[in-house]
Amino acid sequence: EEELQVIQPDKSVLVAAGETATLRCTATSLIPVGPIQWFRGAGPGRELIYNQKEGHFPRVTTVSDLTKRNNMDFSIRIGNITPADAGTYYCVKFRKGSPDDVEFKSGAGTELSVRAKPS
């Protein structure tokens, strides 16, 4: 069985302010079990954008129905984009752990650039 990989096919995405950004991510396997999370930035100061497991993320919707048992598409949409949303977004697979899940694999990242609204 091949080891799970996290694929972010888009190196960069350009979105106009006020529009919706789609950030694509797929996993190549369902195993090991564990949640997907999206972050902006890397390292200890990274910002959690979406957690499959829990939390309230009103600007974020998933492209696919994550309640499908065979789902491997973890792409997200972020609504009402502003220049403050610019940055590199990482799709990260965690494997279950106790007491905390353990980071397992990260995608290569997608850089989101925001085009200002014409005045």
Epitope: I31, P32, V33, D65, T67, R69, N70, R95, K96
Partner: antibody
Framework: DVQLVESGGGVVRPGESLRLSCAAS????????MSWVRQAPGKGLEWLAG????????YYIDSVKGRFTISRDNPKNSLYLQMSSLTAEDTAVYYC???????????WGLGTLVTVSS | SYELTQPPSVSVSPGQTARITCSGG??????YAWYQQKPGQAPVTVIH???KRPSDIPERFSGSSSGTTVTLTISGVQAEDEADYYC???????????FGGGTKLTVL
Amino acid sequence: DVQLVESGGGVVRPGESLRLSCAASGFTFSSYAMSWVRQAPGKGLEWLAGISAGGSDTYYIDSVKGRFTISRDNPKNSLYLQMSSLTAEDTAVYYCARETWNHLFDYWGLGTLVTVSS
Amino acid sequence: SYELTQPPSVSVSPGQTARITCSGGDYYSTYYAWYQQKPGQAPVTVIHSDDKRPSDIPERFSGSSSGTTVTLTISGVQAEDEADYYCGGYDGRTYINTFGGGTKLTVL
């Protein structure tokens, strides 16, 4: 408060069909996968079927594939289990259960009793 | 598929610690939960995701996992904890839910 209320149970003869319903309230039904679990008298729990939040994907234990059909009506906040070709072995209390993000169960209904007897 | 095995019965005195084990499944592909069922009642989830306790469940209930064995621990057992306890698993390889045979906890 999350509430799941099953209905539709009763006494049927072998070979007959029955449709169970589960009315959900207290949460956004269309956001959660759901399952049916049964318990024969004096026996343990047995998972039967699950359905994704949108209703497009269904999953069954081998022993009921082809005889049972799980479905849902999100606007009506309702889950269903259509059962056909019933036998005495299907006699049980049938529970609907809400799934967690990882397909375990966090809330259960009170159950509805199905008795298959000639 | 896989089977989950748990002891048929466990007895403990009030105030003591009860441990119920469940073995089977594969750690990397299976999530586990524990369900409490009292006579004539519906099951209640006391632990999910191996070790996560719902907010309305007393802190004396805890879950842990080691390899292919998961354990439900009830610290300071009370008379009201007497019930059947089922371990349940979800297998990400097969998309199937499975239950153990149940353990009857008797509070002496």
